[in-house]
């Protein structure tokens, strides 16, 4: 990354340009590079108690570059900062620190959480879900015919998945019991979505109308719903509302 590192050479006099190594334009025996060739960045490297000038193609980690008219200079970022825009604004922190608004912190402030991938403090994101979709048709064993009581389902989508500290998503599926006007299955409807059963061809005198799977019927002896009086129907509706159950996968 920092290709040409100009170093001091033996028996160099201060400010002598000849014989400077690498990208140095001028150098001294004691201080290393004093200035750099065009487009290279000048940086001071601490070696023990001494600071040595070096010339680099770009500023090293923990430094930022300023292109002045007469010199390209590397300046140190704050101690906890790995990459910075300038002294005030860090853009990447050193290991163990989290970046928040240009500063490096040990812990993220209240209301924010640490993203351990980017090593930044980010807003806590709560789950967001859509409105419920309409209820599905009333079915029993995958069929919409040949029974009186079944279940219906509705779903909603997750619009925004929560972050680590965000509120979990509420249920996204809801199922409840439902009552339908019992109707016989039409030809070809039988076994739809549900378990298919092989049937003999009807005998000459037999009705061609499909006979519902005995398991699909609540009880053939039950009084059909259309015979219920209005009061019973109302009562049933109230009971069904109370029976409504929610089942779901929590995200």
């Amino acid at each position: 990354q920092n290709a040409s590192r100009g170093r001091r050479q033996r028996r160099m006099h201060p400010n002598v340009s000849q014989g400077c190594q690498g990208g140095c334009a001028t150098c001294s025996d004691y201080n290393g590079c004093l200035s750099c060739k065009p487009r290279l960045f000048f940086a001071l490297e601490r070696i023990g108690m001494k600071q040595i000038g070096v010339c680099l193609s770009s500023c090293p980690s923990g430094y930022y570059g300023t292109r002045y008219p007469d010199i390209n200079k590397c300046t140190k970022c704050k101690a906890d900062c790995d990459t910075c825009f300038n002294k005030n604004f860090c853009t990447k922190c050193k290991s163990g620190f989290y970046l928040h608004l240009g500063k490096c912190l040990d812990n993220c402030p209240e209301g924010l959480e640490a993203n351990n991938h980017t090593m930044e403090c980010v807003s806590i994101v709560h789950c967001e879900v859509s409105e419920w979709n309409p209820w599905s048709p009333c079915t029993k064993k995958g069929k919409t015919c040949g029974f009186k009581r079944g279940t219906e389902t509705r779903v909603r989508e997750i619009i925004q998945h929560p972050s680590a500290k965000g509120n979990l998503c509420p249920p996204t599926n809801e199922t409840r019991k439902c009552t339908v006007q019992r109707k016989k299955c039409q030809k070809g409807e039988r076994g739809k979505k549900g378990r298919e059963r092989k049937r003999k061809k009807p005998n000459k005198g037999e009705s061609k109308e499909a006979i519902p799977d005995s398991k699909s019927l609540e009880s053939s002896k039950e009084i059909p719903e259309q015979r219920e009086n209005k009061q019973q129907q109302k009562k049933r509706k109230v009971q069904d509302k109370q029976k409504s159950v929610s089942v779901s996968t929590v995200h």
Partner: antibody, heavy 116, light 107 residues
Framework: EVQLVESGGGVVQPGRSLRLSCAAS????????MAWVRQAPGKGLEWVAT????????YFGDSVRGRFTVSRDNSKNTLYLQMNSLRAEDTAVYYC?????????WGQGTMVTVSS | DIQMTQSPSSLSASVGDRVTITCLVS??????FVWYQQKPGKSPKLLIY???RLQDGVPSRFSGSGSGTDFTLTISSLQPEDFATYFC?????????FGQGTKLEIK
């Protein structure tokens, strides 16, 4: 709290001189390059000059080079702009600002009017 | 010197609108780019640095994007306090240069 307070503005005749000052507080003044940026009435921002943190080098915009000088006194946390041979086109609000690639801190500005 | 071409020079918008201001730079400056906001009679205030990073205290409805020569400032939902003049600046090299400014006015 960072504060930059400019002073020394006023009305001056063309060809005359004026010296602006900027008193800094709330940050380590000697760590920062300091600059002057100006804004003519109803116009945009124009960089005027920057002096580096230790005062050893200064840079100027083309329109003021040779007429303006910039200096600083790190012991007093103060920045100066010496404006000579003033022209009508130097009329502007002059802002003192901490210049570290971006202009991070700004003063409230001081108005300089060059008019006969 | 690096030239900065900011557009539009003025813009009328309503509270709640999404607005975009652009700045074209005459040479590749990577992300060494800054946006400022200036309200009438006040000094400029640094809004975004390194092309996309928000300065402390700047609301999240402001965002910056771009790299190289094309940069954008977006305000997702204008608030009454956002009506001001916006300037871009390249921080890549000396001399520092600014865009001409975009005055954002209430429609």
């Amino acid at each position: 709290e960072v504060q930059l307070v400019e002073s020394g503005g006023g009305v001056v005749q063309p060809g005359r001189s004026l010296r602006l000052s900027c008193a800094a507080s709330g940050f380590t003044f000697s760590d920062y390059d300091m600059a002057w940026v100006r804004q003519a009435p109803g116009k945009g921002l124009e960089w005027v000059a920057t002096i580096i943190y230790d005062g050893s080098r200064a840079y100027f915009g083309d329109s003021v080079r040779g007429r303006f000088t910039v200096s600083r006194d790190n012991s007093k946390n103060t920045l100066y702009l010496q404006m000579n041979s003033l022209r009508a086109e130097d009329t502007a609000v002059y802002y003192c600002t901490a210049h570290d690639r971006s202009f991070d801190y700004w003063g409230q500005g001081t108005m300089v009017t060059v008019s006969s | 010197d690096i030239q900065m071409t900011q557009s539009p020079s003025s813009l009328s918008a309503s509270v709640g609108d999404r607005v975009t201001i652009t700045c074209l730079v005459s040479e590749d400056i990577s992300n060494d780019f800054v946006w400022y906001q200036q309200k009438p009679g006040k000094s400029p205030k640094l809004l975004i640095y390194a092309a996309s990073r928000l300065q402390d205290g700047v609301p999240s409805r402001f965002s910056g994007s771009g790299s190289g020569t094309d940069f954008t400032l977006t305000i997702s939902s204008l608030q009454p306090e956002d009506f001001a003049t916006y300037f871009c600046q390249q921080s890549y090299k000396y001399p520092p240069t600014f865009g001409q400014g975009t005055k954002l006015e209430i429609k």
